[in-house]
Structures are given as structure tokens and as C-alpha cells.
Amino acid sequence: SPSPVTPSPTLKELIEELVNITQNQASLCNGSMVWSVNLTAGMYCAALESLINVSDCSAIQRTQRMLKALCSQKPAAGQISSERSRDTKIEVIQLVKNLLTYVRGVYRHGNFR
């Protein structure tokens, strides 16, 4: 299926945005809670699956769109259902920080996809 025509955000750009929204922040999105996810199960779609539920929070919209673009690029991305811990909720900022840590690791090891 055709993907959108766009230069997909790079991992570096995603890292920059995640750093931008987490630096000097104790909380994000008024402390909204989201499901914890296993980022190893397709990190873009997994993170998006949790963050898609957050509304009225302009701070993470750019991150959501970046994840959506990256998730959309993957084969049958819409079909992937990530492992999600249905009994564990964490704050949005914690999920974003977890994602930042994970993405930095991926970036360092050069496994961009």
C-alpha cells in the first residue's frame, strides 16, 4: 500500500523533538496517564499506540505526527499490535523519556529501522 510522500523524520529529528519536550519538564499533558508499552515490539507504532489516546496536549503533537509518519512507512504498520501492559499506566512524560532512551540506543547502534 502506498505510503505518504514525505521525507520520513530521521531518528535524529525524533530525538531532538523528544529532548525538546522533556527538558526541564517534571510533567507533560497535565500528568495524563497512558498504557506502558514494550518499545522493542516496533517502537514507532508501539509508542504511537499509547500516545494516540492523548488529546488537548499541544506539547506532544509534533512527536505524535513524527511517530505516525515513521509507523506509516513500515510494511503493514497499521496491522501491528504492540505488546502493551494493560495493567500498567505511566505518565506521558515517563513514556516519552522511555522512548527517548530507547531511540538514543537505537541511534547509537546504527539500527535506524
Partner: antibody
Framework: EVQLVQSGAEVVKPGASVKVSCKTS????????IYWVRQAPGAGLEWIGY????????TYNQNFKDRVTLTADKSTSTAYMELSSLRAGDIAVYYC????????????WGQGTLVTVSS | EIVMTQSPASLSLSQEERVTITCRAS??????LAWYQQKPGQAPKLLIY???NRYTGVPSRFSGSGSGTDFTFTISSLEPEDVAVYYC?????????FGAGTKVELK
């Protein structure tokens, strides 16, 4: 109050280009993307793409590949959609919109701009 | 591209009757689904977002439910001002895609 005001109706010749403007007010222009959607007469809604005025980043629908260009002028809080190589199938009302409440959920819309292709 | 199949294409009901419209996605879109109302000569208006959240100022007779691939939009009691075309939109994946629309008329 968020407002989006679009330029007036256009009549253009086949093969030519058209540029539609969308002037925004009532919010910080760089905070949210501007989306573009079109609607052919008597038909449904078709998403064209969006531009993020913050960094100029764009995402386009593949159906408009190579023919559409989205731009944004921060100094005037105005977004533009240019469509080239126009044909009869491009006759439609073109809307701009913003999404504030949730990502990609377009909630504030312009009044629409009718583009007619005629020789 | 995710295809949104909306049904029925049109329906004609009496005032105060219950309206039910369905939208089926060709892939799992989680709960990233919105519903719009469009009247002739007007831009679409957002009614419901993230499957079941009513947008500001939208009357309580409008509601949405579902998840994954199957979604339902309901008007609990049809009013004359509800005559319009209703569209679903998936916003899980790019490109964003709309259903073909459902025309709601009064008998």
C-alpha cells in the same frame, strides 16, 4: 477565536496551476499544522496533506505526488496550497483546517475555495 | 492506504428516530477515529474524536463507539437540524482517509 479565511474562487485553464491561500488568526500559527482537504462536486472528502509552519515539514497524500506544494508564511500567519497541471478531475472545493484538540483531527476549517478548471 | 467503508450510503428517518451509521477500517486504527457533519455549502464540522469524545458544544444526542476496525456513530433522537452528510475519518495512519459519507434525511 481560531479563524481560517481562504482566498476567493478561481477559474483556471487545464494544465495551469492554482495557488490557494489560508490566512489564520486567533492562535499561534507555528503551534499547529495546516491541513488541506478537497471535495469534488457531489463527492466525499479527500485529504491532500499538511504543513507544519514551525519547521516547514510536509506530508502529502501519494495521490497528489509531484503536483501539490504546501508552504507557510510565518510573518503573515498564512498557509498556501499550490496545485499544478490542473485537469477536470481537480474541480473541487479546497479547504484548509487546523487540528488542536487531538493530533490530525481537523476541527477548525476555512470556508473553502472553489477551483474550476475550464478552457 | 487504509480504506474506510461507511454504511449505509443514505437513510431516511422520522424525527426523534435513532440513527446508526457504521464505519469499517481495512486495518486496525485503534481508537483513532473521528466523525464529521457536513451541511450543503458548508465546511465539515467535527462532532466526535478518538472514537467516543464529543467535541466542544456538540449535543449529547451524538455519540460514537467501537475500536480496531469497526465503529458506530449514533444520533439517539433525530432532529431536523441533523439533516446532513456524515463522514468518518481515520487518523491513525498517513494518508488520513475518510469514509464515503452517509446522507441523513428526514422522512
Amino acid at each position: 477565536e481560531v479563524q481560517l479565511v481562504q482566498s476567493g474562487a478561481e477559474v483556471v485553464k487545464p494544465g495551469a496551476s492554482v495557488k490557494v491561500s489560508c490566512k489564520t488568526s486567533g492562535y499561534s500559527f507555528t503551534d499547529y499544522p495546516i491541513y488541506w482537504v478537497r471535495q469534488a462536486p457531489g463527492a466525499g472528502l479527500e485529504w491532500i496533506g499538511y504543513i507544519d509552519p514551525y519547521n516547514g515539514g510536509t506530508t502529502y497524500n501519494q495521490n497528489f505526488k509531484d503536483r501539490v506544494t504546501l508552504t507557510a508564511d510565518k510573518s503573515t500567519s498564512t498557509a498556501y496550497m499550490e496545485l499544478s497541471s490542473l485537469r477536470a478531475g481537480d474541480i473541487a472545493v479546497y479547504y484548509c483546517a487546523t487540528a488542536v484538540v487531538a493530533t490530525d483531527v481537523m476541527e477548525n476549517w476555512g470556508q473553502g475555495t472553489l477551483v474550476t478548471v475550464s478552457s | 492506504e487504509i480504506v474506510m467503508t461507511q454504511s449505509p450510503a443514505s437513510l431516511s428517518l422520522s424525527q426523534e428516530e435513532r440513527v446508526t451509521i457504521t464505519c469499517r477500517a481495512s486495518q486496525n486504527v485503534r481508537n483513532a477515529l473521528a466523525w464529521y457533519q457536513q451541511k450543503p455549502g458548508q465546511a465539515p464540522k467535527l462532532l466526535i474524536y478518538l472514537t467516543s469524545n464529543r467535541y466542544t458544544g456538540v449535543p449529547s444526542r451524538f455519540s460514537g463507539s467501537g475500536s480496531g476496525t469497526d465503529f458506530t456513530f449514533t444520533i439517539s433522537s433525530l432532529e431536523p437540524e441533523d439533516v446532513a452528510v456524515y463522514y468518518c475519518l481515520q487518523h491513525w495512519n498517513y494518508p488520513l482517509t475518510f469514509g464515503a459519507g452517509t446522507k441523513v434525511e428526514l422522512k
